[in-house]
């Protein structure tokens, strides 16, 4: 039976009809009492006092209502949940993930996890209704957990008409013996000891470091991973592991050449709620590699949206060469990551100037052959984009990747809903398309336009009359990603390039074939 529920947009928690709850008001000491009425939350301020007993974890401040028994926790930055039990910065799980309290909410199949408090899970052995739910990390959220000491975090997903458990795609903190770091590398305990310039790290117990804060003599040295060694560490919450070095007889520090453990192509996908011409409105967390590129024009004031882009490493964006035919100076370009609404700043967005951009030397502006470009983001360090739930790299494909014909893939972008629309979309959209066989990706299928080996075709193969809402890329989506699931990760297969109209039956969109440019990409990204 269909149930009316309320979703608190601020906390993403769900509530049944007539259920009430308290919530803190962000950036103030006020607390609101909310009530679920016909699918809408109705909220008003209520007086509160300090809790008589501690109920909040991780340094949360507990307040309880004056006139009834409910309580609310004001969580410090980095924590969330009813009792501040959720660690929003946990980027991976240790061991089996029994203690994992992060916010990953996608199963290995790509399905979105179900909220543990959902009434549909009431009869399941593990749900947020259990008396020991808080201890097990379960509650009013849909984050992956391992309450039953299974081999890794899991959750319930709805598939084939029923709710069943499935392992999550949450990254493991230590995959095999790979000597790499997650997040900013605060937990890195590997043995790399060279900096990005090739210099050897000084031992943390070196006499030369006397007077420095981060040495083996630091009272917290053991917890920070410092000791009688010269391995790279990040004891101060910097962007990535670093170490002290001697350069020209001068004591300084440098970031290390430790590779970042790849979390590329992992995302927290949420099912789009709204259909729109040409696709579906989407959240940036479902496409965290999507970039929006804006340009200042010599003739007009302000910036205007130019094209999509794809985050492929911390400081590099892939896009389409044809977006840069106006030969903008790099300082006239801006790249925005982590934005759902095209021109509305997102809470967690990251904005960058462009250091330089490289357009393929053999780009043909008639045929759009070699339609590929690289943009280097400007940064004071060797790190630019910081990984988060809304900003993450896509995986580049292996050189020999050959997906079967008609594989379902997806594209995303802020482009127009239809070819004749005068406006770009106000919100990020996604579209689901299938890879065409090369025999169906030829000039004769595309009004005799040139189609080269550097291009691939993809389109919506659903049947339907003239009113069918076929998914496709459109103007403004150029430079954005065509991604397909490969080995459990979203992998970049194409760059949105060109097409004949948008969403026309049996007319595929044309994409730059990324596997043909892997060496070009790597070559141009060299330090």
């Amino acid at each position: 039976s269909y149930q009316v529920i309320c979703r608190d947009e601020k906390t993403q928690m769900i509530y049944q009809q007539h259920q009430s709850w308290l919530r803190p008001v962000l950036r103030s000491n006020r607390v609101e009492y909310c009530w679920c009425n016909s699918g809408r939350a109705q909220c008003h301020s209520v007086p509160v006092k300090s809790c008589s007993e501690p109920r909040c974890f991780n340094g949360g401040t507990c307040q309880q209502a004056l006139y009834f028994s409910d309580f609310v926790c004001q969580c410090p930055e980095g924590f969330a949940g009813k009792c501040c039990e959720i660690d929003t910065r946990a980027t991976c799980y240790e061991d089996q993930g029994i203690s994992y309290r992060g916010t990953w909410s996608t199963a290995e199949s790509g399905a979105e996890c179900t909220n543990w408090n959902s009434s549909a899970l009431a009869q399941k052995p593990y749900s947020g209704r259990r008396p020991d739910a808080i201890r097990l990390g379960l509650g009013n959220h849909n984050y992956c957990r391992n309450p039953d000491r299974d081999s890794k975090p899991w959750c319930y997903v709805f598939k084939a008409g029923k709710y069943s458990s499935e392992f999550c795609s949450t990254p493991a903190c230590s995959e095999g013996n790979s000597d790499c770091y997650f997040g900013n590398g605060s937990a890195y305990r590997g043995t790399h000891s060279l900096t990005e310039s090739g210099a050897s790290c000084l031992p943390w117990n070196s006499m030369i470091l006397i007077g420095k804060v981060y040495t083996a003599q630091n009272p917290s040295a053991q917890a920070l991973g410092l000791g009688k060694h010269n391995y790279c560490r990040n004891p101060d919450g910097d962007a990535k592991p670093w170490c002290h070095v001697l350069k020209n007889r001068r004591l300084t520090w440098e970031y290390c050449d430790v590779p970042s453990c790849s979390t590329c192509g992992l995302r927290q996908y949420s099912q789009p709620q709204f259909r729109i011409k040409g696709g579906l409105f989407a959240d940036i967390a479902s496409h965290p590699w999507q970039a929006a590129i804006f340009a200042k024009h010599r003739r007009s004031p302000g910036e205007r949206f130019l094209c999509g882009g794809i985050l492929i490493s911390s400081c590099w964006i892939l896009s389409a060469a044809h977006c840069f035919q106006e030969r903008f100076p790099p300082h006239h370009l801006t790249v925005i990551l982590g934005r759902t609404y095209r021109v509305v700043p997102g809470e967690e967005e990251q904005k960058f100037e462009v250091e330089k951009y490289i357009v393929h030397k053999e780009f043909d502006d008639d045929t759009y052959d070699n339609d590929i470009a690289l943009l280097q983001l400007k940064s004071d360090s060797s790190r630019c984009a910081q990984e988060s739930s809304v900003v993450r790299t896509v995986c580049l494909p292996p050189a020999d990747l050959q997906l079967p014909d008609w594989t379902e893939c997806e594209l995303s972008g802020y482009g127009k809903h239809e070819a004749l629309s005068p406006f770009y979309s106000e919100r990020l959209k996604e579209a689901h398309v299938r890879l065409y066989p090369s025999s169906r990706c030829t000039s004769q299928h595309l009004l005799n336009r040139t189609v080269t080996d550097n291009m691939l075709c993809a389109g919506d193969t659903r049947s339907g009359g003239p009113q069918a809402n076929l998914h496709d890329a459109c103007q403004g989506d150029s430079g954005g990603p065509l991604v397909c699931l490969n080995d459990g990760r979203m992998t970049l297969v194409g760059i949105i390039s060109w097409g004949l109209g948008c969403g026309q039956k049996d007319v595929p969109g044309v994409y730059t074939k990324v596997t043909n440019y892997l060496d070009w990409i790597r070559d141009n990204m060299r330090p």
Epitope: D179, L396, A399, D519, R522
Partner: antibody
């Protein structure tokens, strides 16, 4: 610190193929390049492979005869040269490239002789 | 292909004295990403080559500061401020900007 250990010396007949391996430890995400040096001669770049994605860039001089592959599970890169001739007798080096070829293998002597 | 021409072919040196090797490329070796991938390698007798200088003027880790690199466009120089006995071997310049990457013919440095 990156360390590269190459397979041992090989003796081959003209027309045969040789496959040289290069096992990496340390940061294995850098390009692996292959460079050869005939006795008493200079260095000659043959090509490169990205151990991650497997993409390659070859010197056209060897195109069609050289194949570079990798096995990420054992952090090993391979260079196979086919249709060997006497002038392919040389020491073959693998070298790891980040900002330059900073780390080199010890070299593998390949002798082509009938 | 970019041809790298080194001079001199052979360089007899006196320990403690300076030495200089020149390298000229047949075309500009500025990469499309703006970097100039001009490196210098030293191959000591019976050993694998070792990196001395990368990207024209950057000294590799552990390389003594008596080695320095300079130049731009098509003309590049490696200087040793005071030659030591351990510096003998063949010095190669190398361009990694245009495929195929190419080495110079080498300069043999030996003690007089």
């Amino acid at each position: 610190q990156v360390q590269l250990v190459q397979s041992g010396a090989e003796v081959k007949k003209p027309g045969a193929s040789v496959k040289v391996s290069c096992k990496a430890s340390g940061n294995t995400s850098y390009w692996i390049n292959w460079v050869r040096q005939a006795t008493g001669q200079g260095l000659e770049w043959m090509g490169r492979i990205d151990p991650g994605g497997g993409s390659t860039g070859y010197n056209q001089k060897f195109q069609g005869r050289v194949t570079m592959t990798r096995d990420t599970s054992i952090s090993t890169a391979y260079m196979e040269l086919s249709s060997l001739r006497s002038e392919d007798t040389a020491v073959y080096y693998c070298a790891s490239y980040y900002y330059a070829m900073a780390y080199w293998g010890q070299g593998t002597l390949v002798t082509v002789s009938s | 292909d970019v041809v790298m021409t080194q001079s001199p072919l052979s360089l007899p040196v006196t320990p403690g004295e300076p030495a200089s090797i020149s390298c000229r490329s047949s075309q500009s070796i500025v990469h499309s990403n703006g970097n100039t991938y001009l490196d210098w390698y030293l191959q000591k007798p019976g050993q694998s080559p070792q990196l001395l200088i990368y990207k024209v003027s950057n000294r590799a880790s552990g390389v003594p500061d008596r080695f320095s690199g300079s130049g731009s466009g098509t003309d590049f120089t490696l200087k040793i401020s005071r030659v030591e006995a351990e510096d003998v071997g063949v010095y190669y310049c190398f361009q990694g900007s245009h495929v195929p990457w190419t080495f110079g013919g080498g300069t043999k440095v030996e003690i007089k």
